[in-house]
Interface confidence: low
């Protein structure tokens, strides 16, 4: 008697591994014999799809070599014309062993930045993604995370950093371990040691010491009033990524000497500069050498105190004049990174109007200094504390730098505004009256040696510094 | 400074390949993934996938399937293949940079317009 | 995928006025390390887009300060604190935390 058919094996779940068989089993009975198809995920498999194999008169669909885009839901419908046509319907999990597809990859990284080593898998179940440097598993923390995709994510990279990285994936199925690749920190040029400025007598011998890190060591060159050093002889070691580089001298001329630490980072290069002077204990260069010439500003640390386009003292003493006065004023200003916001702008307002004095074109060109009443608001008002300090350190003999030797005016040496307004230069960047000076905090036990006027403010300034308003 | 410049036939017929090429430019393409966005008229942006320059390729699953990207460090390009197009992948293609330190697409071509039609 | 949502799809503003788009997540964009994987686009009519803000609130650079993006895990926010002719265009936000990176369908700031 003719009979429906009926499934009596109900397709299930199968779970297959990348490259192996898979089989799925619909037995049917009816009369009379059903025809059947397949399905997978609702699109018919064609009989003559040599990925397949159907056999026991379509009953057995085989996957002769499964791949991950295989899993879905296949079905088996079987029809023989009496009664209905029945289905039954069962998944495929495509299993796979993890496999990496993007390996992390050697990476240079300068210190500070931020480093990505990629680490994408495949895999069912998900792997899960660790990595390993040197021999140990990599703790994460707040600047080291394993990202979703695996990546590694290393953020304010620091040298320790540095090593070989593997990443491990991870699953019910087995494990998968990258090529090891190498992390290298580089790290910008930094002096350790700067070299001491040095008064001396005529005819002395100096050595000057610079020390310089980073990675990859830095080399040293050293520079003389704005050019190469032509004279003198040069020791260099290093140790342990750090090069010591001396400069012995036999002095005849006063001199500005730059260390400069240099350290090349793919294309571009990273640089650290410290300078020191030798001058000569009562050296007295004949009026006639002392000459200068009036030109434009055109450095860039002075830029934002100097009123714009102003004609500065270049001083030939120097065989560069604008390098090395540039050189000076960097110096000291760095110098200045440590002081209070108050101190500051002053300081560095009168640094560099002493340093670039103002400058009066005619048959001779003449520097013109700073009004005494400037240089004692800076000295006795912004940066009393600091004031202080460095001239107790001077007097211990422990002050060695630049804000000392060259950079810092003697105060009481200077033409007073009151005597002569042309003689001198005011600093339109003090800016501040005598109500300011009523509510500033006294900072020094003596008064000052002379008055202090309500200094006229200047329309070329750039900025105003009053004492009771810090600027950072 | 960096630019990058979308370069392919402005039409492309359906069933065919649409292939672009994305040529760096004042700069290099070391260190970077390289990414395509497609953008039809009217409508929003879409990723395709982006490219390493080691090579290896990150596709957008829904059109994986179509997707081909490649890239050439000697001469500063890369570059998409789109096959079996139909009329839906008509839209304005984008070439970017897609800088991992700030997990952004930080430089952008100006885009070239690829109609698909017959 | 993630399914990045924009609000409003349309924002007219008049010129000195503050204007606030928002974007929501289908999922969170923050990650364990701290980091909202969130950036803002701005595509100004008949160019390409170029990026505003990245990693949830940093400004791109060369963007104003009157642009800024606040927000963690799924709802997030770009302000424009004045809003100047220059800034008309369409708005979107763009998860950069999962592949495919997923983009709002975009709102249209445009000068009443």
């Known amino acids: 008697l003719p009979k429906a058919p009926v499934i009596t094996t109900p397709l299930e779940t199968v779970d297959a591994l990348v490259e192996e068989v898979a089989t799925f089993m619909c037995a049917v009975e009816s009369y009379p014999q059903p025809e059947i198809s397949w399905t997978r995920n609702k699109i018919l498999i064609k009989l003559f799809d040599t990925r397949y194999s159907i056999r026991e008169n379509g009953q057995l669909l085989t996957i002769l070599s499964v791949e991950d885009s295989d899993d879905g839901i296949y079905c088996c419908t079987a029809n023989n014309g009496v009664g209905g046509a029945v289905e039954s319907c069962g998944a495929l999990q495509v299993k796979m062993k993890p496999k990496i597809t993007r390996p992390p990859i050697n990476v240079k990284i300068i210190e500070g930045l931020k480093a990505v080593l990629p680490c994408t898998t495949m895999g069912n179940p998900k792997p899960s993604v660790s990595w390993i440097k040197g021999d140990s598993p990599l703790r994460e923390n707040s600047r080291i995370a394993v990202l979703e995709s695996g990546s590694l994510r290393i953020h304010n990279v620091q040298k320790e950093d540095a090593g070989q990285y593997r990443c491990v994936a991870k699953n019910s199925l087995g494990t998968a371990y990258s090529k090891v690749v190498k992390l290298e920190v580089e790290v910008f040029a930094r002096i350790l040691r700067a070299p001491e400025s040095h008064n001396v007598t005529f005819g002395s011998f100096v050595t000057l010491h610079c020390t310089a890190t980073g990675i990859p060591v830095p080399t040293i060159t050293w520079i003389e009033n704005g050019n190469a050093v032509s004279s003198g002889s040069i020791q260099e070691s290093v140790k342990d990524r750090v090069i010591d580089s001396r400069l012995q001298l036999f002095i005849t001329k006063p001199g500005l000497y730059t260390c400069i630490a240099t350290n090349k980072h793919g294309e571009k290069f990273s640089t650290a500069k410290a300078a020191a002077t030798i001058s000569i204990a009562e050296w007295s260069k004949p009026q006639k050498d002392n000459k200068g010439y009036c030109a434009q500003y055109r450095g860039e640390v002075c830029n934002a105190v100097l009123a714009k386009d102003a004609l500065v003292f270049l001083n030939t003493s120097y065989a560069d004049p604008e390098e090395a006065q540039e050189l000076l004023v960097h110096t000291a200003w760095n110098e200045l990174k440590v002081v209070s916001p108050v101190c500051r702008p002053a300081a560095e307002a009168l640094l560099c109007n002493h340093i670039f004095q103002e400058c009066s074109p005619g048959v001779v060109p003449t520097p013109i200094p700073i009004c005494r009443e400037y240089c004692l608001a800076v000295k006795e008002l912004f940066c009393a504390k600091e004031w202080l300090v460095m001239e107790e350190k001077t007097h211990r003999g422990l002050y060695r730098s630049e804000m000392h030797l060259l950079s810092v005016p003697e105060c009481s040496k200077l033409p007073s505004m009151h005597w002569d307004p042309t003689a001198c230069a005011r600093l339109p960047h003090l800016d501040y009256n005598k109500e300011n000076l009523k509510t500033f905090p006294p900072m020094t036990s003596s008064k000052p040696s002379v008055d202090i006027p309500n200094l006229p403010s200047s329309s070329s300034s750039s900025f105003s510094v009053s004492p009771t308003y810090s600027m950072t | 400074q960096v630019q990058l410049q979308e370069s392919g036939p402005g039409l492309v017929k359906p069933s065919e390949t649409l292939s672009l090429t994305c040529t760096v430019s004042?700069?290099?393409?070391?260190?970077?993934?390289w990414t395509w966005i497609r953008q039809p008229a009217g409508k929003g942006l879409e990723w395709i996938g982006r490219?390493?320059?080691?090579?290896?390729?990150d596709y957008n699953p829904s059109l994986k399937s179509r997707v081909t990207m490649s890239v050439d460090t000697s001469k500063n390009q890369f570059s998409l293949k789109l096959s079996s197009v139909t009329a839906a992948d008509t839209a304005v293609y984008y070439c970017?940079?897609?800088?991992?330190?700030?997990?952004?697409?930080?430089?952008w071509g100006q885009g070239t317009m690829v109609t698909v039609s017959s | 995928d993630i399914v990045m949502t924009q609000s409003p799809l349309s924002l007219p503003v008049t010129p000195g006025e503050p204007a606030s788009i928002s974007c929501r997540s289908s999922q969170s964009l923050l990650h364990r390390n701290g980091y909202n994987y969130l950036d803002w686009y701005l595509q100004k009519p008949g160019q390409s887009p170029q990026l505003l803000i990245y990693l949830g609130s940093n400004r791109a650079s060369g963007v104003p300060d009157r642009f800024s993006g606040s927000g963690s895990g799924t709802d997030f926010t770009l302000k424009i604190s004045r809003v100047e002719a220059e800034d008309v265009g369409i708005y979107y936000c763009?998860?950069?935390?999962?592949?495919?990176?997923?983009f709002g369908q975009g709102t249209k700031l445009e000068i009443k």
């Open positions: 004042g700069g290099s393409i070391s260190s970077y993934y």
């Open positions: 763009m998860q950069a935390l999962q592949i495919p990176h997923t």
């Open positions: 970017a940079r897609y800088n991992w330190n700030d997990d952004a697409f930080d430089i």
């Open positions: 490219i390493y320059t080691s090579g290896s390729t």
